[in-house]
Interface confidence: low
C-alpha cells in the first residue's frame, strides 16, 4: 500500500534506532572511503529530516523516494571526484540510474588498513565513554569492507557485540571473556558476508528465475512438511528481502525481514515443527534463528517422484501449461526427499530434468524419450559424492593447513594468473571445508561441502570480476552458476602459462615473520608456496614439499637465532639458491 | 608398510657416548624429515633433534645443543643421533620419527614413529 512518505513509514516500522543504524550501514556500503565523522554527520540530517516527515508527511520533499534521498545526500559529499574518481559522475544521473551506478562501484576488495585490534583495556574504555559512538564505528567498519552484508543480520551481529562488551568489561578477567566472543563474531561475519554475497551475486548475475530455484530447493529442505504453495509464497517474501537488501534498499529489506519472520512465526503449524524456540525470541535473533533452522522432519510415506513426474502421460501437458511452476513442484518434490543433497546438486538435476522435457516433449513419442530421465541423474549424484569422500580423505590424513597446501598447488595450477593473495585466500578458505564438513554423517557432508565451496568459490569470481586475468576463471564464473565448482574441479594444469619471472624479492623474509601469530605465519608461507608455483608450475609435489621443508626450518632456525635479522639475510640467501637448485629454476 | 627401527640404545655412564640409527623402509626416506624425541618415565614426551629432508636444516632442544648431533644417510635410509656428554637426565626412551613437512615440535605433526629404544646412563 502506498504511503504518502516513504521514509516516515520506514522510521515509524523500523524506529529510530535501526533506521540510524540502517542509513549508517547503507551510506557506509556505498562510499567505502568516507570517513566514520562524515557519514556519521549525514546520517544525523537524514535522521533529522525523517522526523520532520513523520511530524508532517505533507512537507517538503518527504514525498520523494529513498533512493533520491539518499543519493542526493551522498553527492553532497565534497570530496567525492577526488576519493571516489568516477563514481562521481554518478550524481549526474537521475534515479533509478543513478542508484544502479552507486551500485556498481561497490567494491568487494577496497584499499582500506586490516582491522587491528586494540587492547581489551582500550576498548573497554571507549565503550564506556561512548557507547553509541563505539557501536556505530562497529557498524561502519563492518559495512565498508563487506558492502554486501545482509544488513538486518549486521544489527543482529551488533547487538551480541554490544551484549559482549557489556558483560566482559566488567569481568574479572576482561580480555579471557571478551576475546574468545569478538574471535567467534569475526569468523560468523566473514562467513555472514561470503553467504550474502552469493546470493546477491545469483540475483545479480543470474537473475531473480535462479534466484528463486535455489530458494525453492533450500527451503523445501528445510520445510519439508510445508506444502507447495506455503513454500512458494515464502521463496517469493523471502526473493523481495534479499533483492531489497542487494539493491541497497536496506530500510525496506529490513521491514520486509521483519514482516517475514512474523508471517513464519504466526504460520508455524503449516511450516516446520521446529519454529517454536526461534519464534519466541527476540524480533532480530528470531530473524537469525529462522535463517539457521534445521531441517524438520520428512513426512512418513512420501510417494515415488516417478509416478507424477515419469510415468504419468501427462507430464508434458503439465509442463507445457507452466512450465516454472511445473518445474518448482519438482524441485519441491525433490528437495524435501533429499536433505542430503547439496542445493546446487538440487538444481543440476532440476536443470536436466527441465532439458528433458524441452527435447522430449517435442519429439514423436515424449513418454518414451523421457522415460530413462532419472537415469541420468545417477552420474550427477555420484561426482559430488565420490569428490567429498577423496577430500574428506585427503584431509584426514593431512590436517587442515597441508590439505589447504594441496589445494593452493591444485589451484595456483588450474589458473596461476590469479593474484596471489587471492588464491591464498580462497585455497585456504576452500580447505576449511575439511574441519567444516568432513566430521558429519554421510546424509549431511554434501550439502555442507558443496553448498560451502559455492560460496568460497564466489568470492573468486567476485574478486576476479573486479580485475579480470583468466579466462578460465571467467568460463567457469559466468556459464553456470551452479555449475561452477564443477567447472573448477574439471580444470588441468594450464599448459598456456608462462612461468613467472624469478625474483629472490619475493623469497626475501625478515624478523617481523617472528612475532606473527600462527594464523599469520600460515599465510607467508602459503603465499610462498603459491609464488614457487607460478614460478614452476610443472614442480612436483615432493620437490614443492622439500623446498616448503626448508623454508620452515630456515624460519625456525632464524627465529631462534640471537641476532635475527643477520639470520634472515645470510640464511636467506643460502634458501633461495637451494630452492632454485631443487625447483631447477 | 612403513617401518622406523631403533637401535643402538644401553646403559652406559655419565659422560660416556653413545650412537642412536633408525633405519627406515616403505617410504620415500629422502622426502621426510626426521626427528628424535625422547620420554622419560612420568614424563611428557618431547622432541630432541630433527633433521629436515635434505640434512640442510637441524633443530637441536636446549638441553642437548653441543652435546648430541644428528645426521641422516638418504641414500642408506638411515639416521643417526651422535650422543656425547651424557648425563642421567638424558635416561629416557628415544623415539625416532617422520614426519613430511619439517615439524615444529609439536608430535601430531610426526607422520611415522618408531617402537623406542632405552637410553639408561647411570654410574
Known amino acids: 500500500d502506498a504511503h504518502k512518505s516513504e521514509v516516515a513509514h520506514r522510521f515509524k516500522d523500523l524506529g529510530e534506532e535501526n533506521f540510524k543504524a540502517l542509513v549508517l550501514i547503507a551510506f557506509a556500503q556505498y562510499l567505502q572511503q568516507c570517513p566514520f565523522e562524515d557519514h556519521v554527520k549525514l546520517v544525523n540530517e537524514v535522521t533529522e529530516f525523517a522526523k520532520t516527515c513523520v511530524a508532517d508527511e505533507s512537507a517538503e520533499n518527504c514525498d520523494k523516494s529513498l533512493h533520491t534521498l539518499f543519493g542526493d545526500k551522498l553527492c553532497t559529499v565534497a570530496t567525492l571526484r577526488e576519493t571516489y574518481g568516477e563514481m562521481a559522475d554518478c550524481c549526474a544521473k537521475q534515479e533509478p540510474e543513478r542508484n544502479e551506478c552507486f551500485l556498481q562501484h561497490k567494491d568487494d576488495n577496497p584499499n582500506l588498513p586490516r582491522l587491528v585490534r586494540p587492547e581489551v583495556d582500550v576498548m573497554c574504555t571507549a565503550f564506556h565513554d561512548n557507547e553509541e559512538t563505539f557501536l556505530k564505528k562497529y557498524l561502519y567498519e563492518i559495512a565498508r569492507r563487506h558492502p554486501y552484508f545482509y544488513a538486518p543480520e549486521l544489527l543482529f551481529f551488533a547487538k551480541r557485540y554490544k551484549a559482549a562488551f557489556t558483560e566482559c568489561c566488567q569481568a574479572a578477567d576482561k580480555a579471557a571473556c571478551l576475546l574468545p566472543k569478538l574471535d567467534e563474531l569475526r569468523d560468523e561475519g566473514k562467513a555472514s558476508s561470503a553467504k550474502q554475497r552469493l546470493k546477491c551475486a545469483s540475483l545479480q548475475k543470474f537473475g531473480e528465475r535462479a534466484f528463486k530455484a535455489w530458494a525453492v530447493a533450500r527451503l523445501s529442505q528445510r520445510f519439508p512438511k510445508a506444502e507447495f504453495a506455503e513454500v512458494s509464497k515464502l521463496v517469493t517474501d523471502l526473493t523481495k528481502v534479499h533483492t531489497e537488501c542487494c539493491h541497497g534498499d536496506l530500510l525496506e529489506c529490513a521491514d520486509d525481514r521483519a514482516d517475514l519472520a512474523k508471517y513464519i512465526c504466526e504460520n508455524q503449524d503449516s511450516i516446520s515443527s521446529k519454529l517454536k524456540e526461534c519464534c519466541e525470541k527476540p524480533l532480530l535473533e528470531k530473524s537469525h534463528c529462522i535463517a539457521e533452522v534445521e531441517n524438520d522432519e520428512m513426512p512418513a510415506d512420501l510417494p515415488s517422484l516417478a509416478a507424477d513426474f515419469v510415468e504419468s502421460k501427462d507430464v508434458c501437458k503439465n509442463y507445457a501449461e507452466a512450465k516454472d511452476v511445473f518445474l518448482g513442484m519438482f524441485l519441491y518434490e525433490y528437495a524435501r526427499r533429499h536433505p542430503d543433497y547439496s542445493v546446487v546438486l538440487l538444481l543440476r538435476l532440476a536443470k536436466t530434468y527441465e532439458t528433458t522435457l524441452e527435447k522430449c516433449c517435442a519429439a514423436a513419442d515424449p513418454h518414451e524419450c523421457y522415460a530413462k530421465v532419472f537415469d541420468e541423474f545417477k552420474p550427477l549424484v555420484e561426482e559430488p559424492q565420490n569428490l567429498i569422500k577423496q577430500n574428506c580423505e585427503l584431509f584426514e590424513q593431512l590436517g587442515e593447513y597441508k590439505f589447504q597446501n594441496a589445494l593452493l598447488v591444485r589451484y595456483t595450477k588450474k589458473v596461476p594468473q590469479v593474484s596471489t593473495p587471492t588464491l591464498v585466500e580462497v585455497s585456504r578458505n576452500l580447505g576449511k571445508v575439511g574441519s567444516k564438513c568432513c566430521k558429519h554423517p554421510e546424509a549431511k557432508r554434501m550439502p555442507c561441502a558443496e553448498d560451502y565451496l559455492s560460496v568460497v568459490l564466489n568470492q573468486l569470481c567476485v574478486l576476479h570480476e573486479k580485475t579480470p586475468v583468466s579466462d578460465r576463471v571467467t568460463k567457469c564464473c559466468t556459464e553456470s552458476l551452479v555449475n561452477r565448482r564443477p567447472c573448477f574441479s574439471a580444470l588441468e594444469v594450464d599448459e598456456t602459462y608462462v612461468p613467472k619471472e624469478f625474483n629472490a624479492e619475493t623469497f626475501t623474509f625478515h624478523a617481523d615473520i617472528c612475532t606473527l601469530s600462527e594464523k599469520e605465519r600460515q599465510i607467508k608461507k602459503q603465499t610462498a608456496l603459491v609464488e614457487l608455483v607460478k614460478h614452476k608450475p610443472k614442480a612436483t609435489k615432493e620437490q614443492l614439499k622439500a623446498v616448503m621443508d626448508d623454508f620452515a626450518a630456515f624460519v625456525e632456525k632464524c627465529c631462534k637465532a640471537d641476532d635475527k635479522e643477520t639470520c634472515f639475510a645470510e640464511e636467506g640467501k643460502k634458501l633461495v639458491a637451494a630452492s632454485q637448485a631443487a625447483l631447477g629454476l | 608398510d612403513v617401518q622406523l627401527v631403533e637401535s643402538g640404545g644401553g646403559v652406559v655412564q655419565p659422560g660416556g657416548s653413545l650412537r642412536l640409527s633408525c633405519a627406515a623402509s616403505?617410504?620415500?626416506?629422502?622426502?621426510?624429515?626426521m626427528g628424535w624425541f625422547r620420554q622419560a618415565p612420568g614424563k611428557e614426551r618431547e622432541r630432541v633433534v630433527s633433521?629436515?629432508?635434505?640434512?640442510?636444516?637441524?633443530y637441536y632442544a636446549d638441553s642437548v645443543k653441543g652435546r648430541f648431533t644428528i645426521s641422516r644417510d638418504n641414500s642408506e635410509n638411515t639416521v643417526y643421533l651422535q650422543m656425547n656428554s651424557l648425563r642421567p637426565e638424558d635416561t629416557a626412551t628415544y623415539y625416532c620419527a617422520a614426519a613430511r613437512y619439517w615439524a615444529t615440535g609439536s608430535e601430531y605433526e610426526f607422520d611415522y614413529w618408531g617402537q623406542g629404544t632405552l637410553v639408561t646412563v647411570s654410574s
Open positions: 616403505g617410504l620415500t626416506f629422502s622426502s621426510y624429515a
Open positions: 633433521i629436515s629432508r635434505g640434512g640442510g636444516y637441524t
